[in-house]
């Protein structure tokens, strides 16, 4: 069974900064990742970045750089502006389109216990949807 | 599909400048590398700059110095400005996007003629 896992990292040096790393376990090719906030894409979730393996990478704020890593993983650093960090409490939820799979979504967050510059683990909570 | 559309080629003096522009036409996303090669008669087609839409530059050594890579605002164009050009310049220009950086799929533009001679 085709698995998302989904990384949330706070960078040691600029606490205001996190990286979400997100990947894809399983056959197929990916067609398109959207990485989302507050909750899945489409149920609540607030579109953050869209990445296309072959038409490219699209991207809103606070999203700062959405780039692919291998064929089947990719990272977004998101730059927090405010005093106050919500990203700490946020979930991030991403999803990719694998054909003939259909699409696997998976959220994670930060722990509350996390030091800057540790990353969560690998700790996928799948919403099986193949559409 | 990303379509590469070229501009600015042309015949020039040594010494002199040209800048090329390359833009993707109609695409709704940023792409990630996009680039310039080159190909001089009887000649492989070579790397001359590629830019990453973070900032990250490479140039081949002969340009080094010379030439200068940008991309405009959108991502989804990018700019060779030449100066100092010499006759060994003289190819055509391919612009080149690589949308996820991985190689996965290549677009090419047309190609646009430099001729450096006096």
């Known amino acids: 069974t085709p698995e998302v896992w989904v990384q949330v990292q706070m960078e040691a040096t600029e606490l205001s900064s996190f990286t979400v790393h997100c990947g894809f376990l399983g056959p197929g090719s990916i067609s398109l990742v959207t990485v989302s906030w507050g909750g899945p894409d489409g149920a609540g979730g607030t579109k953050l970045a869209v990445l296309h393996p072959e038409l490219g990478t699209r991207q809103w704020a606070p999203a700062r750089q959405a780039r692919w890593e291998t064929q089947s993983s990719i990272s977004l650093a998101l730059e927090d502006s405010g005093a106050s960090s919500p990203f700490a409490n946020t979930t991030f939820c991403c999803k990719f389109a694998s054909f003939p799979e259909g699409s696997w979504e998976s959220c994670g967050s930060l722990p509350p216990s996390s030091d800057p510059g540790l990353s969560a683990p690998p700790t996928p909570v799948p919403i099986l949807r193949a559409d | 599909e990303v379509q590469l559309v070229e501009s600015g080629g042309g015949l020039v003096q040594p010494g002199g400048s040209l800048r090329l522009s390359c833009a993707a036409s109609?695409?709704?996303?940023?792409?990630?590398?996009m680039g310039w090669y080159r190909q001089a008669p009887g000649k492989d087609r070579e790397l001359v700059a590629t830019?990453?839409?973070?900032?990250?530059?490479k140039y081949v050594d002969s340009v080094k110095g010379r030439f200068t890579i940008s991309r405009g605002d959108a991502k989804n164009s990018v700019y060779l400005q030449m100066n100092s050009l010499r006759a060994e310049d003289t190819a055509v220009y391919y612009c080149?996007?690589?949308?996820?950086?991985?190689?996965?799929?290549?677009?090419w533009g047309q190609g646009t003629m430099v001729t450096v001679s006096s």
């Open positions: 109609e695409t709704y996303f940023d792409l990630y590398v």
């Open positions: 080149n996007a690589d949308p996820s950086g991985l190689g996965r799929k290549v677009y």
């Open positions: 830019i990453t839409y973070t900032g990250s530059i």
